[in-house]
Interface confidence: low
């Protein structure tokens, strides 16, 4: 038992619909015989139905947890003694227990049950960016870009809206980019302009609101 | 190995009705579970589907005639089939979804079918 011995956190955090990588480092007796290849699995605790289906693993012949599959990787080799976790488009019910199990047919099998990983979902508290290059002029056409600089790139892309209660530019009340372009108008002045960005793979949006400062160039005539 | 075991078809009158069962052996649990049907010479269809909590999904076709339910604790699958049409005739297939992937193919379990025939 000496010999089996995996380092990792005790406890990661991450927020729903973004991604946490947990580096992890596996150790198992070496047996000079020939063996086949080890294979490692990622595991969740306590699971009733289908104890035995990792939530990731590094066999091809393996069943996986549909409800993981895609957004759990065993990024690291276990051959290489990594047992390195990536999670995407993380959800609330992620949130559970997890424990690695190394295979090398036909001898060992070890499920590292006293290294447990301690994974917590919380909800996602952040908020996109709305970025206004300048001042909005009446009349002049301006890109207005919704971003959200903390979601990371290997999730699954999320879905941007605009909403507005009165933009007379807007053609229709949404628009599918990250990019608004529009032309704002003086009545368009105090307008709350609302981006919207939804996070698919777990579910979830967020959403940022500001008041449009619309100014006039000297000269321009009040309607 | 997880095995599905199909009863309740036959031959019925239009107009009559027919119970159809599906039960699993083998231990699996199951998330969501459905009914599909082939008449000879078209291709599967979906009947009617129902998740682990109990919401339902029926075809249109279907809809007010046949109502799908499950035994959670049994394991089993029932479709209760009211006001037969000649139409309905077709190979009965159960479908169980246990929530698994394979090579990050979803794993399905199929029944071998049941036989149903409305004719007078």
């Known amino acids: 038992d000496l010999e089996f011995q995996l380092v990792a956190p005790e406890s990661v955090t991450v927020e729903e619909g973004l991604c946490v990588h947990v580096p992890c480092s596996v150790f198992y007796p070496s047996i000079k015989l020939t063996l086949g290849p080890v294979t490692g699995s990622w595991l969740r605790k306590g699971v009733s139905l289908h104890e035995d289906s990792p939530v990731a693993t590094s066999d091809p012949r393996q069943l996986v947890q549909k409800a993981t599959q895609g957004r759990f990787q065993l990024l690291g080799d276990p051959q290489k003694h990594d047992c390195s976790l990536f999670i995407r488009d993380a959800q609330k019910n992620d949130t559970g227990m997890y424990f690695f199990r190394v295979v090398r047919e036909p001898f060992v099998r070890y499920s590292y049950k006293k290294s447990q990983l301690s994974l917590h979902v919380t909800s996602l508290s952040r908020t996109p960016d709305i970025i206004i290059p300048g001042t909005l002029e009446a009349g002049y056409p301006s890109n207005l870009t919704c971003s959200v600089p903390w979601a990371c790139e290997q999730g699954t892309p999320p879905t941007f809206s605009w909403m507005s209660t009165a933009l007379t530019s807007l053609s229709s009340r949404t628009t599918d980019s990250s990019v608004l372009t529009f032309t704002p108008q003086p009545q368009d002045h105090g307008t709350k302009l609302t981006c919207l960005v939804t996070f698919s793979g777990a579910g979830v949006t967020v959403e940022r609101t500001i008041q449009l400062n619309v100014t006039r160039k000297s000269g321009q005539m009040r309607e | 190995e997880v095995q599905l075991v199909e009863s309740g078809g036959g031959l019925v009158q239009p107009g009559g009705s027919l119970r159809l069962s599906c039960a699993a052996s083998?231990?699996?649990?199951?998330?969501?579970a459905a009914w599909y049907r082939q008449a000879p010479g078209k291709q599967r269809e979906l009947v009617a589907s129902?998740?682990?909590?109990?919401?339902?999904n029926y075809a249109d076709r279907v809809a007010g005639r046949f109502t799908i339910s499950r035994d959670n604790a049994k394991n089993s699958l029932y479709l209760q089939m009211n006001s037969l049409r000649a139409e309905d005739t077709a190979v009965y297939y159960c479908?169980?979804?246990?929530?698994?992937?394979?090579?990050?193919?979803?794993?399905?379990?199929w029944g071998q079918g049941t036989m149903v025939t409305v004719s007078s």
């Open positions: 129902i998740s682990y909590g109990g919401s339902t």
């Open positions: 479908r169980l979804d246990p929530g698994l992937a394979l090579n990050n193919r979803p794993l399905y379990y």
């Open positions: 083998g231990g699996t649990f199951v998330i969501n």
